[in-house]
């Protein structure tokens, strides 16, 4: 029997029944083994079928086999109920070999032609199954010339039988005090082959408790004991199991805070697998009673390890562990069953005792001394020399622990001083010089750094003067020693005051006449304000009313008398503001310059002299009654006059506060 | 020379008064103050107060206003210091000293030799 | 009322060697006044304003200082300088003294 190619020559080629197209002799028998590489098949198919018919193909016939496999026996032309004849059918060898064999009887009723087939190898496609047939792979499956191969997907690892997929399920470690597990794919089917580990793993303290949850299928044996698929469960003091079947195992208490369990699957088998939902208990913590005024959160029915709570105070009261004030509170339970912190207390917000205020006093609303949540104080100013600024003084004690006012606000009050008090009042009159007394000018100044000069006390730590008179020490201020309280020059008994700052004003040109003649001292320290010491106000915009032509002014300082000495004790005098054009027209013939008499300047004194300020009282106030207020304030700074002091015809010249109130305050608003 | 005299030791019995007198010389009695002070045995110096010689103006710690008087006599250039209701505790010398006059006022520039008041029963 | 803290309060020293003698303030002073008291005798001015040097008071004497620390320092002790020294302030009502420092023969 002549054999057919034999890869790896091409496989292909036409196979006919002998003296084809002519008809076959008798008594013919003929054989064709094809072969194709392997991961081939071949396939056939008929061009020409003419053979006799018999029943069942007694006769003639071509059969096809592959292997041991007989695919098809056939005769005749047509197929009938009995007989098979190709027609257009196509044949495929079961594996890389076929075997055609061609018979013919010892007669022909009448001449057949044969047969004439073509035939080629072509891949088989291993992927495609027939139906009910087992899937050639796990997962995928990948065919390709000459063959195939099988891949899993993620999570799995195809096993070395090179079709199965095994899943990678191991060393999964749960470690939060409860949670759920199951096989792989579960509620599907559980997959071959594989061997599952998973961990829990609580801390020290915890016990795990195992719930079999919704079904369990497992692969069983009626006899043996879990002999293909098993579930172990494994702790420290003993094993679980193994588990496998349709019944869900009891629950499992295993008194272990770490627990392993196996699951191990074979090569067959379509069951679903079990799931677990695990919980942790421990020994219990004493219940938390909140402490009066606060309470616990989260609210539980027991409170075991590693479980917290807080304690939250009501408002107006504050956490406090011992006598310790705490920000926040969370207790937490240990694996003893005791707590890690002990209660703490809910404690009444408490305030403390309320700041003093500066040139003021407070005073106990509530109860004397109480200073907790809600209670209320009331500051007030030192009556008469102080009044509070923009507050109504009434403070609350707030449970954030700080006493606050009814705007809000947390800070003290300020008490600023009453400015423009003084013991004496004017009658209008004119008249000599004379002694000042307690209290009547208690913003005057004594200014001692080289020369003797004077100012006015501005609030509680500034000092209204002359510019001219600090010039010298605009660049060391300290070097000025400032006086003030006292009636007397010499007096040991002054209120001691030092300079932090000198401001001449930009507009002063030293040793070039008197225009803008005027400094503020800043003091490094408030003075505190009494009978003695009170500043001066500062005119109002109304001020001009009360500082016409022939309206009277005082001047005081210590500055030179009629003797020609400095004065031992504070002189003042009555003078009345003379006509400025006027008091221009004194001051323009020699020896003075013209126009040595500003705008920024006022002048005041007698046409007859004999009344006038004078070296040593430069920088001190011309000072004013506002009748409406009832107050003094300044409307000049004694700046400059005639040689010889209360000369006839000559005037003090004084700089013209109202002219600079924007300077002023500017400066005193920025320092 | 400037100088400061003080009137000679004391001795008396609790309850009683003590004046002690401080005479000035070489300067002008009335341009000072003139201040006491004291200094009980072993120990430090005790401000008591001060008088300006040109008004009789005084002053005095508050420890001892109800107590000490302060007095002058502009004709004499003198100054005294009366002490009542002693004590024992009040044994001590007593000074009268100058106030300086040329930059501060806060210091004694002039010293009298000190008055040994002593209180005894 | 300032407190004034002295030390030493006593120190032994020999002829020719550098004496300092502090004087601390309870708070801020301004000006510094130190006195030199020989036994039976009143006190004698020595520094004021803190370094200015009495009249007739020899150089190796000499007074510094700001706010609550001031020192007197006798550059070179003199036979004559073996007294107690006192510090007085009055930047603050009432005027007070410290509590003395004596200094002795070695």
């Known amino acids: 029997t002549p054999l057919g190619p034999k890869w790896p020559e091409p496989v292909f080629g036409r196979l006919a029944s002998p003296g084809f197209p002519g008809e076959y002799a008798n008594d013919q028998e003929r054989r064709w083994t094809l072969t194709a590489p392997p991961g081939y098949r071949l396939r056939l198919y008929f061009t020409h079928f003419d053979l006799e018919l018999s029943h069942l193909c007694e006769y003639d016939f071509v059969k096809l086999s592959s292997g041991a496999k007989v695919l098809a026996t056939l005769c005749g032309q047509e197929s009938t109920d009995t007989e098979r004849a190709p027609g257009k059918d196509t044949f495929y060898s079961l594996g890389s070999s076929l075997d055609i064999t061609f018979r013919s009887d010892y007669s022909n009723e009448k001449p057949f032609t044969g047969f004439e087939a073509f035939y080629a190898a072509e891949d088989i496609d291993e992927c495609q199954v027939a139906p009910g047939e087992a899937p050639t792979c796990d997962h995928h499956c990948h065919n390709h010339l000459g063959g195939f191969y099988c891949s899993c997907r993620a999570g799995y690892v195809l096993h070395r039988n090179k079709r199965t997929c095994s899943a990678l399920c191991s060393g999964q470690v749960f470690t939060q005090r409860s949670g759920e597990l199951s096989s792989p794919e579960y509620p599907r089917p559980y997959p071959k082959l594989s061997s599952c580990t998973y961990s829990i793993s609580l801390e020290e303290g915890f016990s795990v408790i195992l719930d079999f949850v919704e079904s369990f299928d497992v692969e069983t044996h009626p006899e043996t004991l879990c002999p293909y698929d098993f579930l172990k469960i494994q702790t420290d003091r003993e094993e679980h199991g193994p588990f496998c079947g349709k019944t869900l195992p009891h629950r499992i208490e295993t008194k272990s805070n770490t627990v392993t369990i196996t699951f191990v699957t074979d090569e067959s088998g379509d069951h679903t697998g079990w799931k677990i939902h695990y919980t942790s208990t421990a020994q219990p913590c004493p219940y938390p009673m909140a402490p009066p005024n606060g309470h616990v959160s989260p609210v539980q029915a027991k409170y075991i390890l590693k479980d917290s709570f807080s304690i939250f105070c009501e408002t107006g009261y504050e956490l406090l562990q011992g006598h310790l004030p705490l920000k926040s509170f969370t207790a937490v339970c240990q694996k003893d069953g005791s707590w890690d912190r002990p209660m703490p207390a809910c404690s009444i917000v408490d305030c403390g005792p309320p700041d003093d205020l500066p040139s003021g006093r407070v005073e106990y609303i509530t109860g004397p001394g109480v200073t907790t949540y809600k209670a209320v104080i009331q500051y007030s100013c030192e009556e008469t020399f102080y009044t509070m600024k923009v507050n109504d003084g009434k403070y609350v004690c707030e449970a954030d622990g700080f006493w606050t006012s009814s705007k809000g606000e947390k800070s003290l009050p300020v008490c600023e001083p009453v400015c423009g008090l003084s013991a004496r009042t004017t009658g209008g009159r004119i008249y000599g010089g004379q002694k000042a007394k307690p209290g009547d000018f208690p913003w005057q100044v004594l200014i001692l750094g080289g020369t003797t000069a004077a100012g006015a006390l501005l609030y509680d730590n500034w000092v209204l003067t002359a510019a001219h008179a600090v010039y010298e020490q605009k660049h060391d201020a300290s070097a000025l020693d400032i006086r003030m309280g006292t009636l007397k020059r010499l007096s040991p008994h002054y209120t001691q005051a030092w300079s932090e700052a000198v401001f001449i004003h930009e507009g002063y040109t030293h040793d070039a006449g008197f225009d803008n003649d005027i400094a503020l001292i800043k003091l490094n320290n408030k003075v505190v304000i009494n009978s003695n010491i009170t500043p001066i106000c500062l005119p109002r915009k109304e001020a001009e009313s009360f500082m016409r032509t022939d309206d009277i002014g005082t001047a005081s300082g210590w500055g030179l008398t009629q003797r020609g000495f400095l004065a031992r004790n504070l002189m003042y005098v009555d003078i009345p503001i003379v006509d400025h054009q006027k008091c221009t027209a004194a001051y323009e013939k020699p020896p003075y310059p013209r126009g040595s008499v500003t705008a920024n300047m006022l002048c005041a004194g007698l046409e007859s002299g004999g009344k006038d300020s004078c070296r040593g009282d430069s920088g001190g106030a011309l000072v004013f009654l506002d009748s409406e207020t009832e107050r003094w304030f300044v409307g000049g700074i004694v700046s400059w006059g005639s040689m010889n002091c209360g000369e006839a015809g000559q005037y003090g010249v004084y700089t013209k506060v109202i002219n600079y109130i924007p300077w002023i305050e500017n400066i005193i608003s920025d320092f | 020379q400037v100088q400061l005299v003080q009137s000679g030791a004391e001795v008396k019995k609790p309850g009683a008064s003590v004046k002690v007198s401080c005479k000035a010389s070489?300067?002008?009695?009335?341009?000072?103050?003139m201040h006491w002070l004291r200094q009980a045995p072993g120990q430090g110096l005790e401000w008591i107060g001060d008088?300006?010689?040109?008004?009789?103006?005084?002053h005095y710690i508050e420890k001892f206003k109800d107590r000490a008087t302060l007095t002058i006599d502009k004709s004499s250039s003198t100054a005294y210091m009366e002490l009542s209701s002693l004590r024992s505790e009040d044994t001590a010398v007593y000074y009268c000293?100058?106030?300086?006059?040329?930059?501060?006022?806060?210091?004694?520039?002039?010293w009298g030799q000190g008055t040994l008041v002593t209180v005894s029963s | 009322d300032i407190q004034l803290t002295q030390s030493p309060s006593s120190l032994s020293a020999s002829v020719g060697d550098r004496v300092t003698i502090t004087c601390s303030a309870s708070?801020?002073?301004?000006?510094m006044y130190w006195y030199q008291q020989k036994p039976g005798k009143a006190p004698k001015l020595l520094i004021y304003?803190?370094?200015n040097l009495a009249s007739g008071v020899p150089s190796r004497f000499s007074g510094s200082g700001s706010g609550t620390d001031n020192t007197l320092t006798i550059s070179s002790l003199q036979p004559e300088d073996f007294a107690t020294y006192y510090c007085?302030?009055?930047?603050?009502?009432?005027?007070?003294f410290g509590q003395g420092t004596k200094v002795e023969i070695k």
């Open positions: 000293a100058r106030g300086d006059i040329t930059t501060t006022l806060r210091y004694f520039d002039v």
């Open positions: 708070s801020s002073v301004r000006y």
């Open positions: 070489g300067y002008t009695f009335t341009n000072y103050h």
């Open positions: 007085q302030q009055w930047s603050s009502y009432p005027l007070t």
């Open positions: 304003d803190t370094s």
């Open positions: 008088i300006d010689a040109s008004d009789s103006e005084t």
